[in-house]
């Protein structure tokens, strides 16, 4: 019986460890600055790193600019978006800006897109200052189903800060769906 | 066999409970206002509370102004930094401010420091208003190894809000590394 | 013995799954725009949705405008609050605004209320611009006891953005208390 108990314990340790790891998808995606769209309108950001520097992904998929859920669950989603402008880049078209981020969820089964979280600010970036900067952070807890896709839209993409510590988004699974 | 099963179940409950608690380090550190540096340049904040009010720590270490990781894992890191100024404190040097936070990771083995997250804003704090306030929040999911250290750098530390609900940072372990 | 092992494994799977779900309360509450108070003073927001759109709750209770903890534990708490104004709504009383959020904890046993997190900004919303927007995000890791209540206070509630992706708060349990 002792041997049997050891076997039970052993199999449980394996099972617990394996199921715990499998049950916890995550992603932290950082902006790919080589392919930031221009303009001041609202656009979807499709170029993100998933495997260099701080960027990483596990049990989720990054495809066509979207973070794809592979496992049903409740996830904490977050995004940090930084905008900046230096006078050496030339003058802005306008001193009044709307700097915004929208974290959206798309369901393939029912082709529809919905905004989960938004944040940002209107800003007056006066020509009297040589440098301007602004960051947005949003986060929230959402039920995600396998196949659903998370994407990021921003206004004024040409002003995005291309650093990996500045402009990123991510998700991690917290628990299963009952 | 029933007794044996009970023993297996019992030992498993203990093991599961114990390993779950051990596997989940966390910290929530609040600013120690008695020792905030002056100046408007970027400085590392080294004085934080870890055991009073909302501040707490478990399975991590706070030493020399840094939060030290004791256990490999993926952690959610966050920081909330508030800046404020009232005219009764005297006039500012300039009306333009860069109010920033940098969450950095230092590896002792390979002596290097890297910024994981940054946030903030340039602000125009006009002398026409008697009070000014601004808060930054950043958060993200990172792989941390035992011995690595997390620290906080800010610009304009003399403007920090010293309240425990205003200026703090923290971390909690979400999952093991595969 | 093989049958017994299967039974042990089976009961453990049930137990592990059940205890994991029971051990992880959460809530994501979105603003109920039909009942936002007026004025520019600091007020407690009592109308939130808990079961429509992105709003959801499990193993926590929403009552009298407060999120009630049913299970001791360490929780990650967060809030996202958006303010906005369009000139079509009429002029603001003042161009200088303090846009703030306070996440508070109330203990029934010891009738007291404490601010866990605060964030926001003073803003100059000039009449020269037809639209203004600003979002605040705060988050932190806190020990909560059964019966304690979380509530949200804001300044200038009449400026709140009523969208579910804009103004919300939430919590999820990360771990037990040792």
């Amino acid at each position: 019986i002792r041997a049997e108990k050891a076997m039970v314990d052993g199999s449980w340790l394996d099972l617990a460890k394996r199921s715990k790891l499998e049950a916890q998808p995550f992603a932290h995606l950082t902006i790919n600055a080589t392919d930031i769209p221009s303009g001041s309108h609202k656009v979807s950001l499709s170029s993100w790193y998933h495997d260099r520097g701080w960027a990483k992904i596990s049990n989720m998929t990054f495809s066509n600019g979207k973070l794809i859920v592979n496992q049903d669950g409740f996830y904490y989603l977050y995004a940090n978006i930084c905008f900046r402008h230096h006078e050496t880049s030339g003058d802005l078209a306008t001193e009044y800006l709307q700097l915004m981020v929208y974290v959206t969820k798309t369901s393939i089964k029912i082709p529809s897109s919905h905004t989960l979280m938004k944040g940002g600010s209107t800003k007056y970036w006066s020509g009297n200052s040589e440098f301007h900067f602004y960051s947005i952070n949003v986060g929230g807890f959402f039920k995600l189903r396998s196949g659903e896709e998370i994407s990021i839209e921003v206004s004024n993409p040409s002003l995005l800060d291309p650093d990996q510590d500045a402009t990123y988004f991510g998700a991690f699974k917290v628990r299963d769906i009952d | 066999i029933r007794a044996e099963k009970a023993m297996v179940d019992g030992s498993w409950l203990d093991l599961a409970k114990r390993s779950k608690l051990e596997a989940q380090p966390f910290a929530h550190l609040t600013i120690n206002a008695t020792d905030i540096p002056s100046g408007s340049h970027k400085v590392s904040l080294s004085s934080w509370y870890h055991d009073r009010g909302w501040a707490k720590i478990s399975n991590m270490t706070f030493s020399n102004g840094k939060l030290i990781v004791n256990q490999d894992g993926f952690y959610y890191l966050y920081a909330n930094i508030c800046f404020r100024h009232h005219e009764t404190s005297g006039d500012l040097a300039t009306e333009y401010l860069q109010l920033m936070v940098y969450v950095t990771k230092t590896s002792i083995k390979i002596p290097s420091s890297h910024t994981l997250m940054k946030g903030g804003s340039t602000k125009y704090w006009s002398g026409n208003s008697e009070f000014h306030f601004y808060s930054i929040n950043v958060g993200g999911f990172f792989k941390l190894r035992s011995g690595e250290e997390i620290s906080i750098e800010v610009s304009n530390p003399s403007l920090l809000d010293p309240d425990q609900d205003a200026t703090y940072f923290g971390a909690f372990k979400v999952r093991d590394i595969d | 013995i093989r049958a017994e092992k299967a039974m042990v494994d089976g009961s453990w799977l049930d137990l592990a799954k059940r205890s994991k779900l029971e051990a992880q309360p959460f809530a994501h509450l979105t603003i109920n725009a039909t009942d936002i108070p007026s004025g520019s003073h600091k007020v407690s927001l009592s109308s939130w949705y808990h079961d429509r759109g992105w709003a959801k709750i499990s193993n926590m209770t929403f009552s009298n405008g407060k999120l009630i903890v049913n299970q001791d534990g360490f929780y990650y708490l967060y809030a996202n609050i958006c303010f906005r104004h369009h000139e079509t709504s009429g002029d603001l009383a003042t161009e200088y605004l303090q846009l703030m959020v306070y996440v508070t904890k109330t203990s029934i046993k010891i009738p007291s209320s404490h601010t866990l997190m605060k964030g926001g900004s003073t803003k100059y919303w000039s009449g020269n611009s037809e639209f203004h927007f600003y979002s605040i995000n705060v988050g932190g890791f806190f020990k909560l006891r059964s019966g304690e209540e979380i509530s949200i206070e804001v300044s200038n509630p009449s400026l709140l953005d009523p969208d579910q992706d804009a103004t919300y708060f939430g919590a999820f349990k990360v771990r037990d208390i040792d």
Epitope: N128 | G39, A93, Y96, Q98, N156 | -
Partner: nanobody, 125 residues
Framework: KVQLVESGGGLVQTGDSLRLSCAAS????????MGWFRQAPGKEREFVAV????????KYADRVKGRFTISRDNAKNMVYLQMNSLKPDDTAVYYC??????????????????WGQGTQVTVSS
């Protein structure tokens, strides 16, 4: 974007006075802290004085305290340095500089964004 031009330097005797002026153009400097630095031959550039954006707060290097006075006129986009009781070791090129951001005064050159070309002050014994 900001151009600074110093004037008022020259050759004077020990104990004399000089008034340096700094004219700013290209952008209003009324939101900036404005400072004076000096650099003697073979030495590092050193802080002399700084004035905050509205002229309500001043800071001086210890060696000029009580002898030099910094002032500004935001309407004219001008900054001044009144130098009294000059000594031979005040001899240097004097630079006007703009600190464009920050809650506290900068006393190191790195904290200043815009600089003038400098004006020579020579104090003979």
């Amino acid at each position: 974007k900001v151009q600074l031009v110093e004037s008022g330097g020259g050759l004077v005797q020990t104990g004399d006075s000089l008034r340096l002026s700094c004219a700013a153009s290209g952008r209003a400097i009324g939101s900036y802290a404005m400072g004076w630095f000096r650099q003697a031959p073979g030495k590092e550039r050193e802080f002399v004085a700084v004035i905050n954006y509205r002229g309500s707060s001043l800071k001086y290097a210890d060696r000029v305290k009580g002898r030099f006075t910094i002032s500004r006129d935001n309407a004219k986009n001008m900054v001044y340095l009144q130098m009294n009781s000059l000594k031979p070791d005040d001899t240097a090129v004097y630079y006007c500089a703009a600190q464009t951001s920050g809650a506290d005064f900068g006393t190191t050159p790195q904290r200043y964004t815009y600089w003038g070309q400098g004006t020579q002050v020579t104090v003979s014994s």
